[in-house]
């Protein structure tokens, strides 16, 4: 078996990739600068901490993560790392051109940095769905496709709907979900005889994968916490996710031993159960006024995504052609969705508890942005898996689905690698 | 007592460069986000710059955007606003402010500038 | 968004009920501050989040409204209460807008 990249992406995607650094590189020339004022350097070391929490979620919780099919978990992580360093960079100028463009040259800080990690990250949740199935020009297409539609989103929701940074960055989840959920849909789904060993996780890259859980169940409340304006929101924030997270573990690994008809534990499963507690929590992280309630919210959101594991990979797999280990898409899909209703339900309460009319406006506003947030996520991930379709990528065969080899040079050449 | 005072404040010529302090006293600094507010002689008031509280992030109104800078050391409990090719149309007395993040209902914040300075005067004049 | 204020100059008793109003070009839910200032004197936060009383402002002084229509009563007018008020919406993206103020008087 020939590990040769196929002739023709060997030319593509080098031209492809460096053109396009070459092209960002000349727009961060042209347009951007640092910031200049003089900060506090010990408060500067905090904030850049921040970012650093959300780089090693990116690059070591969410590469890690989607390492755990037999052959192809080198170009999981490494393919993350890829579309992490490129969408950062058209992150970081897409943010500037939207929001700062009008005044002149676009100012580089640290919170521009984090929020370019954070739309970066969507791509990385999406990508779940398609890895495996796709070449890094193609890749390097989806990574365009997305941050723009997002940070368009981003930028529109705020206009229209006026809600903080926090808020708009929190429909990621479902944004994510459903881009990726709906590329996956455009691109070929039959698996061919003979290629089904390859979509099966195996004993380390599942451990390589559990590793990559851990990282983002230890940083997911840095991850919720990012953007808020505020300390004491901040606090509340990492407190709630923490909890939430503490008890989806719990949940998930109980769950999935419930779930099992010997009671044995499913590395699967507990690979994102573990993290639903802090998609679920994410959106009214800094709204939920005591833990109970975070703890409750982390125990439904753990048991729906054990559930969901179990009884959603079959229809994901027919329909998306979804390998039963990549369950992010379809995980976060459901768990956004409950962030989404929590965080209307507090709305509500809140609302209420104030003596202040207009709940309805509240919610139709909330509800309104939700619905923008999934239209314009599948919309954009259906023009994306249009784009990926395209002959001139050399998309992988489907034979080579789930395989190392068609990208990486091994000194042997050996299967079981 | 909570306090604020402003200072730097003085007479200058147009295109020159000047540069406020705001210093802060009786409360934790680096916990809030800090304003710059203006008010021309005989007008209204005018948001000019804000700073999130670890100073990871700036606003500016944008008749200043590339022109002044907004900047904090919460070690040493003070708010700057770094004034660069100034214009008649700058004169001002310019204010800091604290913004406070204050609970309404259940557990929804809101916004505020609850504390402020007293002013510095910065006049533009040639 | 936008602030506008109505009336710009308003002629009042002591005693007398006033309303001034505040309307926003879009709507900026409750992220609506209220303050008092008076001549060679910084600005005084009388109400926040729309309706809500700031902690030692007397109970005469009190806010509604949401969205983009927005008021401040003063239900009884005292001699320390002749000033200019403004409304600044403290919503989640700059610019945090000011209204032009009201001047209330002594008629």
């Known amino acids: 078996m020939s590990s040769k990249y196929p002739r023709s992406v060997r030319r593509c995607l080098p031209l492809w990739a460096l053109t396009l650094e070459a092209a960002l590189i000349l727009l961060f020339y042209f347009f951007t600068h640092y910031d200049a004022s003089l900060e506090d350097q010990k408060g500067l070391v905090a904030s850049y901490q921040v970012g650093q929490d959300l780089t090693v979620m990116a690059a070591i919780g969410l590469g890690f993560l989607t390492s755990s099919f037999r052959r192809h978990s080198w170009s999981s992580v490494a393919f993350n790392l890829f579309m992490l360093a490129l969408g950062v960079q058209w992150a970081i100028l897409l943010d500037g051109f939207l929001s700062q463009f009008p005044s002149g040259k676009v100012v580089i800080t640290l919170f521009s940095i984090r929020l370019a990690t954070m739309s970066a990250l969507s791509v990385l949740i999406s990508v779940d769905a398609v890895l495996g199935k796709v070449n890094l020009a193609q890749l390097v297409v989806m990574v365009l496709v997305e941050v723009t539609a997002l940070g368009n989103l981003r930028m529109v929701i705020s206009n229209i709907f006026n809600t903080d940074y926090h808020m708009n960055m929190m429909h990621i989840y479902v944004f994510a979900a459903y881009f990726g959920l709906s590329v996956a849909w455009c691109l070929p789904k039959p698996l061919p005889e003979g290629t089904e060993d390859k979509d099966q996780t195996a004993t380390i890259p599942s451990l390589s994968a559990m590793l990559g859980a851990l990282f983002l169940w230890m940083f997911w409340p840095s991850f919720n916490s990012a953007l808020l304006r505020s300390p004491i929101e901040r606090k509340n924030a990492v407190f709630n996710t923490y909890y939430a997270v503490a008890v989806s573990v719990v949940t998930a690994i109980s769950g999935s031993s419930l779930a099992h008809p010997q009671g044995k534990i499913s590395k699967t499963y507990v690979h994102s159960a573990v993290l639903a507690g802090g998609v679920a929590v994410g959106t009214s992280c800094h709204l939920i006024p005591s833990p109970w309630l975070a703890m409750v919210l982390g125990l439904v959101a753990g048991l729906i995504s054990v559930g969901g594991a179990k009884y959603l990979p079959g229809c994901c797999n027919r329909v998306l052609g979804i390998p039963h280990s990549s369950i992010m898409g379809y995980n976060f899909s459901l768990l956004g969705l409950l962030g989404e209703i929590i965080y209307i339900v507090l709305l509500v309460l809140d609302t209420v508890g104030a003596g202040n009319g207009m709940i309805g406006f509240q919610v139709l506003l909330s509800i309104g942005e939700l619905s923008l947030a999934i239209v314009i996520a599948l919309m954009s991930g259906l023009l994306t898996g249009l784009l990926l379709n395209l002959k001139i990528w050399k998309a992988p065969h489907e034979a080579k689905y789930f395989d190392d080899q068609v990208f990486w040079k091994f000194p042997h050449l050996a299967v079981g690698f | 007592e909570v306090q604020l005072l402003e200072s730097g404040g003085g007479v200058v010529q147009p295109g020159r460069s000047l540069r406020l302090a705001c210093a802060a006293s009786?409360?934790?600094?680096?916990?809030?986000?800090m304003h710059w507010v203006r008010q021309a002689p005989g007008r209204g008031l005018e948001w000019v710059a804000f700073?999130?509280?670890?100073?990871?992030?700036?606003y500016y109104v944008d008749s200043v955007k590339g022109r002044f800078t907004i900047s904090r050391d919460n070690s040493k409990n003070t708010l700057y606003l770094e004034m660069n090719s100034l214009r008649v149309d700058d004169t001002a007395v310019y204010y800091c402010a604290r913004e406070a993040s204050m609970l309404r209902g259940i557990s929804r914040y809101y916004y505020a500038m609850d504390v402020w300075g007293p002013g510095t005067t910065v006049t533009v004049s040639s | 968004a936008e602030l506008t204020q109505s009336p710009s100059f308003l002629s009042a008793s002591v005693g007398d009920r006033v309303t001034i109003t505040c309307r926003a070009s879009?709507?900026?839910?409750?992220?609506l501050a209220w303050y008092q200032q008076k001549p060679g004197k910084a600005p005084k936060l009388l109400i926040y989040?729309?309706?809500t009383l700031q902690s030692g402002v007397p109970s005469r002084f009190s806010g509604s409204g949401s969205g983009t229509e927005f008021t401040l009563t003063i239900s009884s007018l005292q001699p320390e209460d002749f000033a200019t008020y403004y409304c600044q919406q403290l919503n989640n993206y700059p610019p945090f807008t000011f209204g032009p103020g009201t001047k209330v008087d002594i008629k």
């Open positions: 700073t999130w509280f670890d100073g990871s992030n700036k």
């Open positions: 879009q709507g900026i839910r409750s992220y």
């Open positions: 009786g409360f934790s600094f680096r916990s809030y986000g």
């Open positions: 989040a729309a309706s």
